[in-house]
């Protein structure tokens, strides 16, 4: 199943020759260009960058590129009124108070319209009271608070680090704690490399910077007011109370310099172990409150930032299939960012701009793909996926019909050590096949496949001598494709030695200092890296597009079905009275996984087999393969999450960022000991298990000889 | 089945011991926190003491009126939890239910009574 | 401490009849409450717990309300078996505490 074949042109139009028209050079000049200003979404700035991509890739070939506009939830600072956070004494005096902006980097002094740092969608307010530091915020640190320590946070200010989970979980879990207030800060320990200098000298993150984010839990819903469909021209829109996700307590974050002022006071409990504990010089008592000498001292927030309905723009070009247009690869990645966006999404977005410009050469000459390609410059990732999410609901007919596979393209780099990939398992085997034809840009791998220093760098956990390849969670605009839709999907970039660097993400990630210069002069300065992504994510696109036969592995489904089976069981079987009180039992999805396995296997072996010279053959076996991550839809969606509807993946319901197998049961047993009635609480485990076998085995039967 | 089963009270002396037990079933004791409270006709229902599971490394929680005076503990192996009173006072004369985390099933109790 | 205060302390139903008892905590306790039922000589059963979710095996008769400080029990049709005693407690933090208790008697 090769797809060296071309259509209509000369053989010379294959793989080959799209990889060998993708230059490094390029891909450093279009992130140069889109990282000289602010691209903050819903702004003039941004509508003027979508109007240049869509001109660019006119030119570069495709057959159309449309403007596509949304008018959805925004958050924004008050300019007149900024948010800062102070500590207040007995008299109500603020005798500190947190900065208002990031010292701006060299050469970006006199740069208009940079945001100061803010957490999007955060409702106003003045909350006063004692602090109590929570850790990272996840739910096994407030379980540690309450649990075991004994400590309240209702009514009370909590100041977590950043970091290990989605921002916007850590203000839930706040929330659900009973806070009023949420302060948020990078510590060193997680974004300040050891050995490595600060901004502009290094990589790092100085005291004075601070990571935006917004702080939603959508859970795959979209624009905030419009849950389920487009926020189109005629949309009905909620009210503000009834929007989807907001956070209900105000929230701020701040860097290192002003988290130690507010950490060095901390009184109360000690830290109950080593793992609350950061690098900057202060005990991290969790408190509540100030120690003895300061213990009349308050926090007080002031949050003044607004929701605004705004109109964004995706971009949407499309390159025609000559044999099948009705069927869509889709590569896609975000245009807007919280400043300059020199990583996040530029790093993406100049990638995705030189396989546009490698393809539509290749049109120029005469060559089509089989299938017609979709590239998307989405707006509004960083406000929670709004653009790509409110494109597909105004799509999703044609989605679900017509879509073979969406590959994401956020920041290409998060790092420069190895490859990192997270895909459904239907692409593993193309991932494989493509990584070992490219060669790698490793240091000491020169003259050495992708597929050998990735698999060294990064091996599989299970199976040896072949490498690491992760379940898809969320946080990017995959998530409307594979949660909601059931479109297999995939996303690569070159990432960090995870072994060695344990700080989470990189430590100028969403600051002001995240420009062109971070990337050229410390991440990768020859754009190799930048280049061998290009490489990944367009060859994908490119396989996908163009192979006769689509280059999907049903058998790969079976194994990790039978892994995450195996774990979901295991995690089960920490209550085995209760399994017998209840008669829980999992053997209807091990035998749906082995009716799988046994179903894959003879679908494969067709595969080899039939004549693909007939095209109705083919495009039956193929639509079997499209259809099959859609079979793992479920239409009512998960419990309390209709949006995330794959029964196999779905985000963690404790951090967005990571996936979750078998979510359903995962979830129902989740914490079941401390569920107040286990009659119920059993009884939703059974009811997941249940639907979990059932979409297996229906899934099975989607790949069963049709007649 | 949810089952709790109080055992060895009595009568005791001012001033005296006793170690109450209770042995748990239908449920798999060692992840679960327990419980024991107290009941008067004069105070009515009154929370005594907790202890978590291993997983909460075995944290235990007392109210005042025992503090220093009792000790829960558990034997997860005999799926048992267990409650050793000392000094005991005329005013913890009570029936002693075992109960499951947030009261959700309690045993049929044990009665001690503190009398000269 | 946390100080639940129940009323009335007793109070006479017919069969048929609805009934309503409410439980008072000294401060916020969320939903953090139970409702439990005692017959004479046995232990308390569960009947309500988060204030408002009804345990299982529990008669769609009692329904529970309330979050903050004021909560209530209800019993939209009092039946024969039902007279006897009903306490609400919070587990919202440490004492873990309990009202004085409702006797409710039949008419």
């Known amino acids: 199943k090769s797809s060296n074949e071309a259509t209509n042109i000369t053989p010379k139009h294959n793989m080959k020759a799209f990889l060998d028209e993708l230059k490094a050079e390029n891909i450093k000049k279009f992130l140069y260009n889109f990282t000289q200003i602010p691209h903050l979404a819903g702004t003039e700035q941004n509508f003027q960058l979508a109007k240049q991509i869509q001109s660019q890739w006119k030119e570069f070939g495709l057959d159309s590129v449309e403007l596509a506009h949304y008018d959805v939830l925004l958050s924004y600072p008050n300019k007149t009124h900024p948010n800062y956070i102070s500590i207040i004494n007995e008299d109500g005096n603020e005798i500190f108070n947190t900065s208002l902006f990031e010292p701006p980097p060299p050469g970006y002094e006199n740069v208009s319209d940079i945001v100061p740092p803010f957490s999007a969608f955060s409702p106003q307010g003045m909350p006063e009271g004692d602090l109590v530091y929570v850790n990272y915020a996840r739910t096994e640190d407030f379980f540690k608070l309450e649990r075991d320590m004994k400590i309240n946070c209702s009514g009370k200010i909590v100041i977590a680090r950043y970091g290990k989970v989605f921002r916007g979980n850590k203000v839930k879990n706040a929330q659900l704690a009973g806070a009023k207030g949420v302060i948020l800060y990078s510590d060193p320990a997680d974004y300040f490399a050891p050995g490595v200098k600060s901004y502009p000298d290094g990589w790092n993150l100085p005291g004075g910077g601070v990571q935006r984010g917004n702080i939603l839990n959508l859970n795959g819903a979209g624009d905030p007011l419009t849950p389920g469909y487009p926020a189109n021209e005629y949309a009905y829109r909620r009210g503000i109370a009834e929007a989807v996700g907001l956070p209900s307590i105000p929230v701020h974050p701040i860097g290192y310099y002003d988290a130690q002022k507010l950490l060095e006071k901390m009184g109360g409990s000690a830290p109950p172990d080593s793992s609350w504990r950061g690098s900057l010089k202060v005990p991290y008592n969790v408190g509540p409150g100030f120690t003895g000498n300061f213990s009349t001292q308050k926090v007080k927030m002031h949050i003044h930032s607004t929701n605004e309905v705004t109109r964004i723009y995706n971009v949407i070009g499309t390159l025609r299939g000559a044999v099948e247009p009705d069927r869509y690869v889709i590569l896609g990645g975000h245009r807007d960012s919280w400043v300059f966006g020199g990583i996040d999404p530029q790093s993406g977005a100049a990638v995705v701009h030189e396989i546009v410009r490698s393809f539509g050469t290749l049109k120029k000459e005469g060559w089509r793909p089989r299938r017609t390609i979709l590239f998307a410059s989405w707006d509004a990732e960083e406000f929670g996926l709004l653009g790509s999410t409110e494109w597909a609901e105004e799509n999703s007919r044609l989605l679900q019909e017509r879509g073979v596979a969406y590959i994401n393209a956020d920041s290409s780099i998060e790092g420069n050590y190895t490859l990192r990939v997270d895909c459904t398992p239907l692409m593993y085997s193309l991932v494989h096949n493509l990584t070992k034809e490219l060669k790698s840009p490793d240091e000491g791998f020169e003259g050495k496949s992708l597929y050998e220093s990735w698999t060294k760098k990064s091996p599989s956990p299970e199976f040896s001598g072949m490498p690491r390849i992760s379940k898809l969670g969320s946080g990017n605009d995959f998530e409307v494709f594979f949660q909601r839709l059931g479109i297999a999907s995939g996303r690569a970039r070159y990432t960090k030695n995870w072994e060695t660097n344990k700080f989470s993400g990189y430590p100028l990630y969403h600051s002001v200092y995240e420009t062109y210069e971070l990337v050229e002069k410390f991440y990768d300065p020859m754009f190799k890296y930048h280049l061998t992504v290009a490489q990944v994510r367009g060859g994908m696109v490119f396989e996908l597009a163009n192979s006769i036969v689509l280059p999907f592995d049903c058998r790969d489904y079976a194994v990790v079905l039978r892994k995450y089976a195996d774990k979901i069981y295991s995690i089960s079987m920490k209550h085995p009275q209760e399994m017998k009180t209840y008669s829980v039992s999992f053997d209807s999805l091990f035998s749906a996984v082995k009716n799988f396995t046994e179903i894959a296997s003879k679908f494969s072996e067709r595969l080899q087999d039939f004549d693909k010279s007939n095209p109705i053959v083919l495009r039956m076996m193929n639509d079997q393969l499209m259809f099959l991550e859609r079979a793992f839809i479920d239409p009512l969606g998960l419990p309390d999450r209709p949006f995330y509807r794959h029964v196999i993946y779905a985000p963690s319901s404790h951090n967005k960022y990571a996936g979750e197998s078998f979510p359903g049961i995962y979830d129902a047993l989740f914490d079941i000991e401390s569920k107040v009635d286990p009659s119920k609480a059993w009884g939703e485990v059974k009811r997941q298990i249940y639907v979990a076998a059932f979409t297996v085995q229906a899934a099975a039967e989607t790949l069963s000889e049709v007649a | 089945e949810v089952k709790l089963e109080e055992s060895g009270g009595g009568l005791v002396q001012p001033g005296g011991s006793m170690k109450i037990s209770c042995v748990a079933s239908?449920?798999?004791?060692?992840?679960?926190?327990m419980n024991w409270v107290r009941q008067t006709p004069e105070k009515g229902l009154e929370w005594v003491a907790e202890?978590?599971?291993?997983?909460?490394?075995?944290?235990?929680h007392y109210a005042e009126s025992v503090k220093g005076r009792v000790i829960i503990s558990r034997d997860d192996s005999k799926s048992s939890v267990y409650l050793q009173m000392n000094s005991l006072r005329a005013e913890d004369t009570a029936v002693y239910y075992c109960?499951?985390?947030?009261?959700?099933?309690w045993g049929q109790g044990t009665t001690v009574t503190v009398s000269s | 401490n946390i100080v639940m205060t129940q009323s009335p302390k007793s109070m006479s139903a017919s069969a048929g009849e609805r009934m309503t008892l409410t439980c008072k905590a000294s401060?916020?306790?969320?939903?953090?409450v139970s409702w439990y039922q005692q017959k004479p000589t046995q232990s308390p059963k569960m009947l309500i717990y988060g204030a408002s979710n009804r345990f299982t095996g529990v008669p769609d008769r009692f329904s529970g309300s309330g979050s903050g400080t004021d909560f209530i029990l209800t019993a939209s049709s009092v039946q024969a078996e039902d007279p006897v005693d009903y306490y609400c407690g919070q587990s919202y933090t440490f004492p873990y505490t309990f009202g004085g208790g409702t006797k409710l008697e039949m008419k």
């Open positions: 401060e916020n306790v969320g939903t953090y």
């Open positions: 202890i978590r599971s291993q997983s909460n490394n075995f944290a235990t």
């Open positions: 239908g449920f798999t004791f060692s992840n679960y926190w």
């Open positions: 109960t499951r985390r947030w009261n959700n099933f």
